[in-house]
């Protein structure tokens, strides 16, 4: 039993970081492996991460940690039974990944304005609750080719736009994504994707404009 | 809430033991260090040095670390500091101190034991 | 040891006032910086650990800064409960140690 690709790891920054790797063959890994991950520090513990199954030959950890510090550092040893297969080291702030935005919602009853809001993922407590950027999807169920990203570049987690920059009488659907410059993070997953129906009147004088062609 | 209980008040004599006890209401002890700090009056804060419940793991300040003996009972949640040869500028409040596993600030303290050397 | 130098050692100030307390360490300690308060015969409590992070519970007018030997806690605006002692700590090296104290009083 071999390790094909070495396990690399990504932290959310606050409670979680999941590892992924490649085994030679195929493998349960839940049964066959065990991930010993332990804080580089005085008097700290060593954890084991119990591996699940990500395809034939994949294996994925989620290594549960009580808080993140920029300074952390983590001594990982992949163990099938007694046989060390792999020894590494993971410092999560090196390798973030926020976690998704979640809540999404799509408010219309703002005359011709689309109001989207989704909720931080992080407590404020936490050191990215103020460091989130965002992007934010949007695209046609009927054309493929209408599909576009706006960034948000503030802190607050919402964006305006304007109903009749979409087309009219159609169904739209929206997702959102965070990063964190501070970090030079990854981009977080899509957050789940929301539905509306974009309706909107015409300024009269468009109306006038199209009885005349 | 995490609490932490100390033992009570304590007079000794110059060149004696003293042991304390600190209790915490924590599910899971061995997920914590349990450390020691004292207080003379009216002085600032000492490190004693810290225990990991869980494996025994123990570090001393070294200034302590022929007359200071830090142990636990995993079954009761409770740790104890024994600090041997007294004398008389040993009189102070004594604190433990719990931080998360391989932390290095004391998020709980315990109410103190004052403990008076006095011949 | 690392030697932690608290300036100023005492203060006065007025409710509502911005507080400033900064902590030199003898050498770099990778921001391993922590505050706490302390009350007269009560044990301390932990502010902020790791230079600027706010532990639980506590409220958002204090705030801590700094980086290498430097280091700062700010309270926004002085509230009557925090007439205290206010302690910094370095846990980056063996033996961990404490400044000497700043006593925050009622002008």
């Known amino acids: 039993m071999k390790v094909l690709q070495e396990p690399t790891c990504v932290s959310d920054y606050m409670s979680i970081s999941t590892c992924e790797w490649k085994m030679n063959g195929p493998t349960n890994c839940s049964t066959e492996l065990r991930l010993l991950y332990q804080l580089v520090f005085l008097l700290s513990e060593a954890h084991t991460c119990i591996p699940e199954n990500n395809g034939g030959a994949g294996c994925v950890c989620h290594l549960l940690m009580d808080d993140v510090v920029s300074a952390d550092n983590y001594t990982l040893d992949l163990w099938a039974g007694q046989q060390l297969l792999w020894k590494g080291s993971f410092k999560p702030s090196e390798h973030v990944k926020p976690r998704a935005p979640g809540n999404l919602t799509v408010h219309t009853n703002v005359s011709d304005t689309l109001l989207l809001t989704w909720s931080n993922p992080y407590p404020p407590d936490n050191y990215l609750y103020n460091h989130l950027t965002y992007a934010v999807n949007i695209w046609s169920e009927n054309d493929p080719a209408d599909f576009r990203i706006y960034n948000v570049t503030y802190l607050e987690p919402s964006l305006r736009i304007a109903a009749s920059t979409l087309k009219s009488g159609i169904s739209y659907r929206a997702r959102v994504r965070a990063w964190a410059q501070c970090y030079n993070t990854t981009w977080s997953e899509w957050s789940p994707s929301t539905k509306w129906h974009n309706s909107y009147r015409e300024p009269f004088e468009q109306h006038h404009h199209h009885h005349h062609h | 809430q995490v609490q932490l209980v100390q033992s009570g008040a304590e007079v000794k004599k110059p060149g004696a033991s003293v042991k304390m006890s600190c209790k915490a209401s924590?599910?899971?002890?061995?997920?914590?260090?349990m450390h020691w700090v004292r207080q003379a009056p009216g002085q600032g804060l000492e490190w004693i040095g810290g225990?990991?419940?869980?494996?025994?793991?123990?570090s001393y300040n070294q200034k302590f670390k022929d007359r200071a003996t830090l142990t636990a009972d995993r079954s009761s949640n409770t740790a104890y500091m024994e600090l041997s040869s007294l004398r008389s500028e040993d009189t102070a409040v004594y604190y433990c101190?719990?931080?998360?596993?391989?932390?290095?600030?004391?998020?709980?303290w315990g109410q103190g034991t004052l403990v008076t050397v006095s011949s | 040891d690392i030697q932690m130098t608290q300036s100023p050692s005492s203060l006065s100030a007025s409710v509502g006032d911005r507080v400033t307390i900064t902590c030199r360490a003898s050498?770099?300690?990778?921001?391993?910086l922590n505050w706490y308060q302390q009350k007269p015969g009560k044990a301390p409590k932990l502010l902020i650990y790791?230079?600027?992070r706010l532990h639980s519970g506590v409220p958002s007018r204090f705030s801590g800064s700094g980086s290498g030997t430097d280091y700062t806690l700010t309270i926004s605006s002085l509230q009557p409960e925090d007439f205290a002692t206010y302690f910094c700590?370095?846990?980056?090296?063996?033996?961990?140690?404490f400044g000497g104290g700043t006593k925050v009083e009622i002008k």
């Open positions: 790791y230079t600027s």
């Open positions: 700590q370095q846990g980056n090296t063996l033996p961990w140690t």
């Open positions: 050498q770099d300690i990778s921001n391993y």
């Open positions: 225990l990991h419940p869980g494996n025994g793991d123990t």
């Open positions: 924590v599910y899971t002890f061995t997920g914590y260090n």
């Open positions: 101190a719990l931080t998360t596993a391989g932390r290095a600030w004391f998020a709980y």
